[in-house]
């Protein structure tokens, strides 16, 4: 019979993709680099089902996702169209808040403890999730 393609060890398969859930924290840019080195990318959430799947695995923790407006418009790291795609912002978000006093606004998106998305300062250390196609991860 044909050989079944599986996700690498410590990765979880879901709907044709493989997911890796961090247990440590990094700023958004470092998390993004980590995923790239694994031949993956920060998770791109495209449906309620995927949202629930990631939430169930991460639990109520601030978690970086692959959505940023560091280059101006909001963009998913894999090129998925933001404008027409799934969105799950917390009410009132994104708000590009300046009140943190760290300079600039907020340019990176993360899951909040209830799963809704928030924009935050990219250098905050949060957990993260990598995603890649089945058979593509290192």
């Amino acid at each position: 019979g044909s050989e079944r393609i599986c996700c690498p060890i410590n990765w979880v398969e879901y709907e044709g993709s493989c997911y890796w859930f961090s247990s440590s924290v990094k700023p958004w840019t470092e998390a993004d680099k980590y995923c790239q080195l694994e031949n993956a990318h920060l998770v791109v959430v495209t449906s309620w089902e995927e949202q629930r799947f990631v939430q169930q695995h991460m639990g109520p923790l601030n978690t970086w996702i692959g959505l940023t407006d560091q280059n101006g418009p909001w963009k998913w790291v894999d090129g998925t169209d933001y404008e027409t795609g799934f969105k799950n912002w917390r009410p009132g978000q994104p708000d590009d808040w300046y009140g943190h006093g760290l300079g600039g606004g907020e340019d990176c998106a993360h899951f909040t403890t209830d799963g809704h998305w928030n924009d935050d300062v990219c250098r905050r250390p949060y957990r993260w999730v990598c995603e890649t196609e089945l058979g593509k991860a290192n």
Epitope: D96, G103, G105
Partner: antibody, heavy 117, light 107 residues
Framework: EVQLVESGGGLVKPGGSLRLSCAAS????????MNWVRQAPGKGLEWVSS????????YYADSVKGRFTISRDNAKNSLYLQMNSLRAEDTAVYFC??????????WGQGTLVTVSS | DIQMTQSPSSLSASVGDRVTITCRAS??????LNWYQQKPGKAPKLLIY???SLQSGVPSRFSGSGSGTDFTLTISSLQPEDFATYYC?????????FGPGTKVDIK
């Protein structure tokens, strides 16, 4: 195509009022902070006001605080600037622009406000 | 409030020249510095954001550098369409402020 189009400019007497509008298209309006910037004839750019995507945070230049009010209607993809107690020094081209800490892009074509008796 | 200054206020240059414009902030703005180009009767156009990132669609002859309080916009080889006024702007904190502008005209 991402586009911003201002309207509502015109001639008004000192002490009068005017409401500027900015119609946005081609992007998820509610996801972005929006801004008003003005330019007096022959002068440089002056930031006037900013508003966050859900109107939670609003900021004004000292020169317009208490006289101008920025607002937005995300259902209509529209940004507004209500200008009261207008002065001669408010005469300028008013631009709306999208964005925040990563710069303003795009900009509208501008609408001219002239305050004169 | 953060004050922005630019120098020179105007300069004359020829096509092919290397042009450098400087911008200084009255206090540190880390890298929250943006550069715009404006032509007469037109809206400003974003060239560079966060000090050194080239805006999509902007020619690579434009570059930005600097951090803290001192910043530079460089045009490596001036083209006819580059004659315009250039503004820097800080987006570190409110109120946002622009520099007074640098007019680049033909020598």
């Amino acid at each position: 195509e991402v586009q911003l189009v201002e309207s509502g400019g015109g001639l008004v007497k000192p002490g009068g009022s005017l409401r500027l509008s900015c119609a946005a298209s081609g992007f998820t309006f509610s996801s972005y902070s929006m801004n008003w910037v003005r330019q007096a004839p022959g002068k440089g750019l002056e930031w006037v006001s900013s508003i966050s995507g859900s109107s939670s945070y609003i900021y004004y230049a000292d020169s317009v605080k208490g006289r101008f009010t920025i607002s937005r209607d995300n259902a209509k993809n529209s940004l507004y600037l209500q200008m009261n107690s207008l002065r001669a020094e408010d005469t300028a081209v008013y631009f709306c622009a999208r964005g925040g800490s990563r710069g303003f892009d795009p900009w509208g074509q501008g609408t001219l406000v002239t305050v004169s008796s | 409030d953060i004050q922005m200054t630019q120098s020179p206020s105007s300069l004359s240059a020829s096509v092919g020249d290397r042009v450098t414009i400087t911008c200084r902030a009255s206090q540190s703005i880390t890298s929250y510095l943006n550069w715009y180009q404006q032509k007469p009767g037109k809206a400003p156009k974003l060239l560079i954001y966060t000090a050194s990132s080239l805006q999509s669609g902007v020619p690579s002859r434009f570059s930005g550098s600097g951090s803290g309080t001192d910043f530079t916009l460089t045009i490596s080889s001036l083209q006819p369409e580059d004659f315009a006024t250039y503004y820097c702007q800080q987006s570190h904190s409110f109120p946002f402020t622009f520099g007074p502008g640098t007019k680049v005209d033909i020598k």
